[in-house]
């Protein structure tokens, strides 16, 4: 697994460098998670043809994966810093159950899957420190999440592979949108 942000050899070699600002740390954390997702997607796509054929193979997708919409204030048009930050944190909290599902879904990238999960928890903490309106952030219900996890794990092999692909693709898109938005803040 890649080394978490702040622990790479460049940091060790440059002890006199200015410490990262909160925004820089968040930016770096997201890019680190995106690298991890990239590695996981590589394994998923190599294992099956899910990545090319998901459009034709699926008629309907009812996985309620977080997605950015106009009303969330994260796009350039209608940008709203506070609304957007709440959406990013809420979305990441909602993704956590899906990241838990990804554990044990990888053979050669098991550590990578764990790193993505743990780094996301750290990212949420960074963002919560940045947010002024923490009351607006709704935390998913643990009982609902446990039931969702059980249902996801009960699917057959093909559906689980497809679910894995869809989670990684959506999480990547969500993080990319978050990164663009956070750079405007």
């Amino acid at each position: 697994a890649p080394v978490p942000p702040g622990e790479d050899s460049k940091d060790v070699a440059a002890p006199h460098r200015q410490p990262l600002t909160s925004s820089e740390r968040i930016d770096k954390q997201i890019r680190y998670i995106l690298d991890g997702i990239s590695a996981l997607r590589k394994e998923t796509c190599n294992k099956s043809n899910m990545c090319e054929s998901s459009k034709e193979a699926l008629a309907e997708n009812n996985l309620n994966l977080p997605k950015m919409a106009e009303k969330d204030g994260c796009f350039q048009s209608g940008f709203n810093e506070e609304t957007c930050l709440v959406k990013i944190i809420t979305g990441l909290l909602e993704f956590e159950v899906y990241l838990e599902y990804l554990q044990n879904r990888f053979e050669s990238s098991e550590e990578q899957a764990r790193a993505v999960q743990m780094s996301t928890k750290v990212l949420i903490q960074f963002l919560q420190k940045k947010a002024k309106n923490l009351d607006a952030i709704t935390t998913p219900d643990p009982t609902t999440n446990a039931s969702l996890l059980t249902k996801l794990q009960a699917q057959n092999q093909w559906l689980q592979d497809m679910t894995t692909h869809l989670i990684l693709r959506s999480f990547k898109e969500f993080l990319q949108s978050s990164l663009r938005a956070l750079r405007q803040m």
Partner: nanobody, 125 residues
Framework: QVKLEESGGGLVQAGGSLRLSCASS????????MGWFRQTPGKEREFVST????????YYADSVKGRFTISRDNAKNTVYLQMNSLKPEDTAVYYC??????????????????WGQGTQVTVSS
Amino acid sequence: QVKLEESGGGLVQAGGSLRLSCASSGRTFSSYVMGWFRQTPGKEREFVSTINWSGSNKYYADSVKGRFTISRDNAKNTVYLQMNSLKPEDTAVYYCAASAGGFLVPRVGQGYDYWGQGTQVTVSS
């Protein structure tokens, strides 16, 4: 364990109609996505149609769109395939399938968990 049993197949002239039924023994029928597939000798199993849990969303292969209609009756644990304007190329063994996945509606056989034995449909010209 879910048992699926198709009926309604037979020999029909081109332009004619048939209605296939698939009865399920499972008590949780309404939680399954139901689909119809067909297969001709020496060819791969082909997707025909699928219907979501509630019956609100229906999907068809391009080759049958506008001619075939899928429906389900959750009270009777049965899914139907109404086939109109039949063509000789519709000749195949028709299989009913159930997918227990609670989130995705697949168009490929690997996404389905349970299969019926199949019913022969022959369309003569």
